[in-house]
């Protein structure tokens, strides 16, 4: 009766035919070939590599789009039956119409069916465009990815290659260490046996020293003796030459008796003409006792009295109070003038303090009190100092106000521990504070990192130990 | 040997006062600066307070400043530590300790616990 | 808050060498003599290298104390399980008038 069927013609399209009596009529629906199914193979020349993070969120957009033509396939389907069975009704209609009816209701059918067909095309062909969209930011996304990992695949090859460089460079390290540690375990050895061998040295020199002790203790005795037989002969003499000078004045009045000059500082030798640097005789104020010292008669005008000078390790500041008190070691190289005859020299007039210092760079400065003096022992030879200019620092590394003075076996500092122990030498120690420049010589080398050594904070800093320096006072009305 | 022993320990209230002994022999006393340390529990070693051999010079760490005095007997051979408004966080053991000459401490006593609590 | 700043805690195997470094300043660890301390679990702390480097009589040689600028160290050749202590620098600070000691450093044989 009727026919309908459904087929494929050669270019793909699906053929819906309706079969009426001797009337045959075709209908050609477009067929989307664009879109792929999920079970079709997807094939891109893209690298594979693992997915952006959005690449999950794509896949669930394409079954999103996967189930839409699904339901659009299930919707064409419906259509057919539909289609099918209007026919049937129309196929009756048909029968009892004229033909010429039967043509007009075929193609508003076939118009329906076309406009349906063309709606549903067009919605198909948007949401293609936007697979299209997608399936391509989607292999760029791919790409990116895969230029990126082969950029850290090349990276981890360049790190594994160096690390392989840095164990053969470790390894090779390794064994020179090893080979070090052998070598410093010989040597080790070889100092422990210098060692034992210096103990055997130091005990047999301990024995010498005793030994020469007992000849200075008999040749200080004979030095006594042999001073005493000298200062008799002295005296002879001085009666003998004043016998013959009274003797001679009374044969010839015009020679006149020499008097005896006494100098109290080197300001007082330069004003009386000797202008040369070297040693000369001082005599206490209200005294006869008598000091050596050194006199400046070049710098800055001359006459300074050099009253502390370190150059060279040559003496140990390590120095009892007594010792600090008469003043100890060469005039002529490092020596400490002594504490009572600066104290009693600078408290007769106003003296200036001038302290020059030398490092181990070839540098030197300087610091300039305009003001100084000592108080007595009774008060531990506290310093006072007024006036400081220089180059060696604007703030003065002796600690102001001034502190007493420190000796090992006399502790007069600020501080809980004994500066003078720990630091070395008699100084005016604060707590324990930034100078001492009767510190641990330090030779060239081994001069930083020294808690100990000739210390000028405020010009080198805490650790570091100075090559030379000298202390001189002169008259401020110079 | 050098032996010190610390006593005065134990449990006050915050605001009150304890004064530490520490009683020091086999060494010349007067030769030597001493020192009161303290470690309050799980916690590192604080350095509280020391006199010079000669007692001339003390000091003390600046959170004890003002409430705690340091002195010495040295007839007694004897060290001691006033502490007066005292914390919760005072609570910690005290250690008295020799310091020779270059701020070392050589010996150390077996310590005394001392707990600030209400 | 110490003036002394230590690791607050180091390891290693025995026969490892380990360094505590003590770090400070010129008016401290510049100026003055370091000393380290070691202290064993619930007991009193005990003097173990003085005035930088200088150790006591009865302490190994395999510590070994030194000191570059305002930084001091403390190295421990050859571990042994009885060296798992408390370890502090210590020095006399011209600035606070007093007596500083460092954070403290746990030293763990493994």
């Known amino acids: 009766y009727n026919n309908f069927r459904k087929s494929m013609d050669s270019i793909g399209k699906k053929q819906y035919q309706v079969q009426h009596g001797s009337c045959s009529y075709t209908f050609l629906l477009p067929e989307m070939d664009n879109c792929r199914s999920s079970s079709s193979p997807y094939v891109s020349n893209a690298v594979q590599r693992d997915a952006p993070l959005e690449y999950d969120d794509s896949v669930q957009r394409l079954q999103v789009l996967e189930n839409i033509m699904e339901n659009n396939t299930q919707w064409l389907m419906k259509l057919e039956n539909y289609i099918q069975d209007n026919m049937k009704k129309e196929m009756v209609e048909i029968q009892q119409n004229a033909v010429q009816n039967q043509t007009a209701v075929m193609i508003e059918i076939g118009t329906n069916l076309l406009n349906q067909t063309a709606e549903q095309t067009r919605k198909l062909t948007d949401v293609e465009a936007q697979v299209l969209n997608q399936t391509t930011r989607l292999e760029l996304q791919l790409l990116e990815h895969s230029l990126s990992t082969n950029k850290l695949e090349k990276q981890i090859l360049d790190q594994t290659s160096e690390i392989n460089k840095l164990q053969d460079k470790n390894s090779f390290l390794e064994k020179k260490v090893l080979a070090m540690e052998d070598k410093h375990i010989i040597q080790l050895q070889s100092i422990k046996e210098e060692k034992d061998q210096l103990q055997v040295l130091v005990s047999k020199q301990n024995s010498i020293i005793e030994e020469l002790e007992k000849k200075i203790v008999t040749a200080t005795v004979n030095n006594s003796v042999l001073q005493k037989q000298q200062h008799d002969l002295m005296e002879t003499v001085n009666n003998l030459l004043t016998m013959m000078s009274t003797s001679n004045s009374a044969k010839d009045p015009t020679v006149a008796k020499e008097e005896q000059i006494s100098f109290r500082d080197c300001a007082e030798v330069f004003k009386s003409g000797h202008t040369t640097n070297g040693i000369y005789t001082l005599t206490f104020p209200n005294s006869t006792e008598e000091i050596k010292a050194y006199c400046d008669m070049e710098a800055g005008g001359g006459g300074w009295t050099i009253i502390q000078r370190r150059e060279d390790g040559s003496v140990d500041f390590q120095r009892t109070w007594k010792e600090y008190k008469v003043g100890f070691g060469n005039p002529s190289g490092e020596y400490w003038l002594g504490n009572e005859f600066v104290s009693q020299l600078t408290n007769q007039q106003r003296y200036v303090l001038k302290i020059h210092l030398k490092d181990w760079e070839g540098n030197e400065a300087y610091s300039l009190y305009e003001h100084f003096y000592l108080s007595s022992e009774e008060l531990n030879y506290r310093i006072h100092l007024k006036g400081l200019t220089g180059t060696a620092g604007k703030i003065s590394s002796i600690s102001q106000p001034g502190n007493d003075f420190s000796t090992k076996d006399g502790d007069n500092d600020k501080c809980i521990c004994k500066c003078s122990q720990m630091l070395t030498g008699g100084w005016w120690f604060d707590a324990c504070g930034p100078s001492n420049l009767n510190g641990m010589y330090y030779p060239q080398r081994q001069n930083t990192n020294k808690f100990n050594g000739i210390k000028w904070y405020y010009w080198k800093g805490s650790g570091y130990s100075l090559k030379a320096t000298t202390m001189m006072i002169r008259p401020a009305d110079f | 040997q050098v032996q010190l022993v610390e006593s005065g320990g134990g449990l006050v209230q915050p605001g009150r006062s304890l004064r530490l002994s520490c009683a020091a022999s086999?060494?010349?006393?007067?030769?030597?600066?001493m020192h009161w340390v303290r470690q309050a529990p799980g916690k590192g070693l604080e350095w509280v307070s020391g006199?010079?051999?000669?007692?001339?010079?003390?000091a003390y760490a600046d959170s004890v400043k003002g409430r705690f005095s340091i002195s010495r007997d040295d007839a007694k051979n004897s060290l001691y530590l006033q502490m007066n408004s005292l914390r919760a966080e005072d609570t910690a053991v005290y250690y008295c300790?020799?310091?020779?000459?270059?701020?070392?401490?050589?010996?150390w006593g077996q310590g005394t616990l001392i707990t600030v609590s209400s | 808050q110490s003036a002394l700043t230590q690791p607050p805690s180091l390891s290693a195997t025995p026969g490892q060498r380990v360094t505590i470094s003590c770090s400070g300043s010129?008016?401290?660890?510049?100026?003055?003599?370091v000393n380290w301390y070691q202290q064993v679990p619930g007991a009193a702390p005990k003097l173990l290298m003085y005035?930088?480097?200088k150790r006591p009589s009865g302490v190994p040689d395999r510590f070994f104390g030194s000191k570059s600028g305002t930084s001091a160290s403390l190295a421990i050749s050859g571990l042994q399980s009885e060296d798992e202590a408390d370890y502090y620098c210590?020095?006399?600070?011209?600035?606070?008038?007093?007596?500083?000691f460092g954070t403290g450093t746990k030293v763990t044989v493994l």
């Open positions: 010129s008016s401290n660890v510049g100026g003055y003599p």
């Open positions: 005035t930088d480097y």
């Open positions: 300790a020799r310091d020779p000459a270059y701020s070392q401490f050589d010996y």
């Open positions: 086999g060494f010349t006393f007067d030769d030597c600066a």
């Open positions: 006199i010079s051999g000669n007692s001339k010079n003390v």
């Open positions: 210590a020095t006399w600070d011209d600035n606070l008038n007093g007596y500083v």
